[in-house]
């Protein structure tokens, strides 16, 4: 009996036309939502004038339906048993699942001012930037709508910066009508233990953002894993959102709509400093902001963002060192709300429920030559927003799963 089940599972999780896995893989049957909470700055003037702690108040959720588009350019390669594809991006605002509209206003860090002052360190260039910042009536902080902040707006300061520079700024700009990839993953035909594992991303096996093993593209995209998952496994996956591979470890058994699943979580160790977790040495890319690589819980992804000083963390700086959150008031990290987890059905390796949580932050530093940054006395890693991307298997799919997979085994 068991061998027959194993054989059936092995056949059905292969990523090729006609399998259960393939159908759900091409276009997810799960509704995926991305909720945003924006950190509204309450005291912009005090920060700019006196280098005060930044007081933030989170506002949200603002919810979008995402990942509803089918994979594109799906191409099988029989020679190396891989399938390549593009994952198109799309987001549809869901007013009924949101606290307000896309036209709601927020006081946030001026993304262009913070980025330009970081990218151009030369004092004479900074004098020019200062002139253009003042001329465009820009400041350290700005008021933007949700739609502008997420999906892009024409920045008045950047519009004055001489060619060639993009004048449109947004945390997720460009998003709609773009695609992530090309991904090339193993289809599992020759070796089921490699199914869904990424072979190449954008034609490469490495990212070119990090040194050593940190630069590797490991595991799957977390939507599924090779079948017959064990609790002792460390599940590796790659997330293009955070420009790195990461891992999850078993936490607990969970019953999801009558289906026994394993809950895997991203452990605090994955965010630790190299002092605590030596494996993380290559994620420490500079010595000043990281206080000689002793800070933890924030990831400098500037190399992946054309030099813009973007730092990724968990929401509310969960698992981050006290020095990171010290200049920010109004944060309340807690594991239940702010950690990332994957609920994996162990026989098939399918992720049936997940919550991916991350926070986008921007570094802003004092600058003698830029008037609006002149009074700052310290560096700030400023939280802009945090997001919660969730998906749960639908009732109909769960019934099918129970009858065809878990029911047969039990």
């Amino acid at each position: 009996g068991d061998l027959l089940i194993q054989k059936t599972i092995k056949k059905q999780v292969v990523l090729e036309e006609g399998t259960i896995a393939f159908k759900n893989w091409v276009k997810t049957g799960t509704e995926v939502y991305r909720q945003f909470w924006i950190f509204d700055v309450q005291n912009p003037q005090e920060v700019m004038m006196n280098s005060s702690n930044i007081q933030v108040k989170q506002r949200g959720p603002y919810t979008y339906r995402v990942r509803f588009l089918a994979k594109e350019n799906v191409t099988q390669d029989a020679e190396d048993n891989t399938v390549s594809f593009l994952q198109p991006n799309g987001a549809i605002f869901e007013p009924s699942l949101s606290v307000g509209t896309e036209a709601d206003n927020f006081t946030v860090l001026n993304l262009a001012v913070a980025a330009a002052s970081h990218i151009y360190q030369n004092q004479f260039v900074q004098m020019i930037l200062n002139s253009l910042i003042n001329k465009s009536k820009s400041s350290m902080f700005q008021v933007r709508t949700l739609r502008e902040l997420l999906w892009g707006y024409r920045d008045p300061f950047l519009s004055l910066v001489p060619y060639p520079v993009t004048t449109t700024v947004g945390l997720f700009y460009p998003y709609n009508n773009t695609a992530d990839g090309v991904y090339k993953v193993f289809n599992g035909k020759d070796n089921i233990s490699k199914v869904a594992i990424i072979d190449t991303y954008k034609g490469k096996r490495n990212l070119s953002y990090w040194e050593s093993h940190c630069d590797m593209i490991n595991g799957t995209d977390a939507a599924s894993f090779p079948p017959f998952v064990e609790k002792s496994q460390v599940l590796q996956f790659f997330s293009s959102d955070i420009c790195r591979s990461i891992y999850a470890v078993f936490e607990s058994d969970v019953n999801l709509k009558g289906i026994p699943v394993y809950r895997f979580v991203l452990p605090s160790k994955a965010f630790a400093s190299p002092v605590e977790n030596p494996d993380n040495y290559c994620f420490c890319t500079e010595k000043i902001i990281s206080k000689n690589c002793t800070s933890y819980g924030v990831l400098d992804i500037s190399k992946c963002k054309e030099g813009r000083p973007v730092y990724i963390s968990l929401p509310h700086f969960l698992y981050a060192s006290p020095d990171v959150s010290e200049p920010i008031d109004g944060l309340n990290p807690n594991e239940e709300e702010h950690r990332t987890y994957l609920d994996i059905e162990p026989i098939t390796g399918f992720t049936l429920q997940f919550a991916k949580r991350l926070q986008v932050n921007l570094l802003v530093k004092p600058s003698e030559k830029i008037q609006v940054l002149k009074n700052l006395k310290r560096n700030y890693i400023v939280p802009i927003l945090w997001l919660n991307e969730t998906g749960t298997i639908g009732d109909e799919k769960a019934n099918m799963f129970r009858s065809q997979v878990t029911g047969k085994i039990n």
């Epitope: 360190q121 030369n122 004479f124 260039v125 020019i128 910066v161 001489p162 060619y163 520079v165």
Partner: nanobody, 118 residues
Amino acid sequence: QVQLQESGGGLAQPGGSLRLSCAASGFTVSTYAMSWYRQAPGKERELVALITSAGGITDYADSVKGRFTIARDDAEKTVSLQMNSLKPEDTAVYYCSAWRATLFKPYWGQGTQVTVSS
């Protein structure tokens, strides 16, 4: 290669005028922010005037506002600085500079000396 050559410096009386010119070669001035900086003895180099490629927007240091005018001639590939109502504190070496977003530091000319004295 990129070259900037200043001319027009010299000695002027207080209240007098001078016109500095900067000839550019090896690039198109219309796609750069063109600036004049100055450095007085024992002082830091400061930005005096700037003209951007985007709509020819100009900006001036507070100390020269209303007295100095920057202009660009794209056809002639020159940038000028008309300096009126000169003061002794305008005495400095004046440098022409070009910058755009692809550069981490500006291009510089050699500089031209301006002395305001009676």
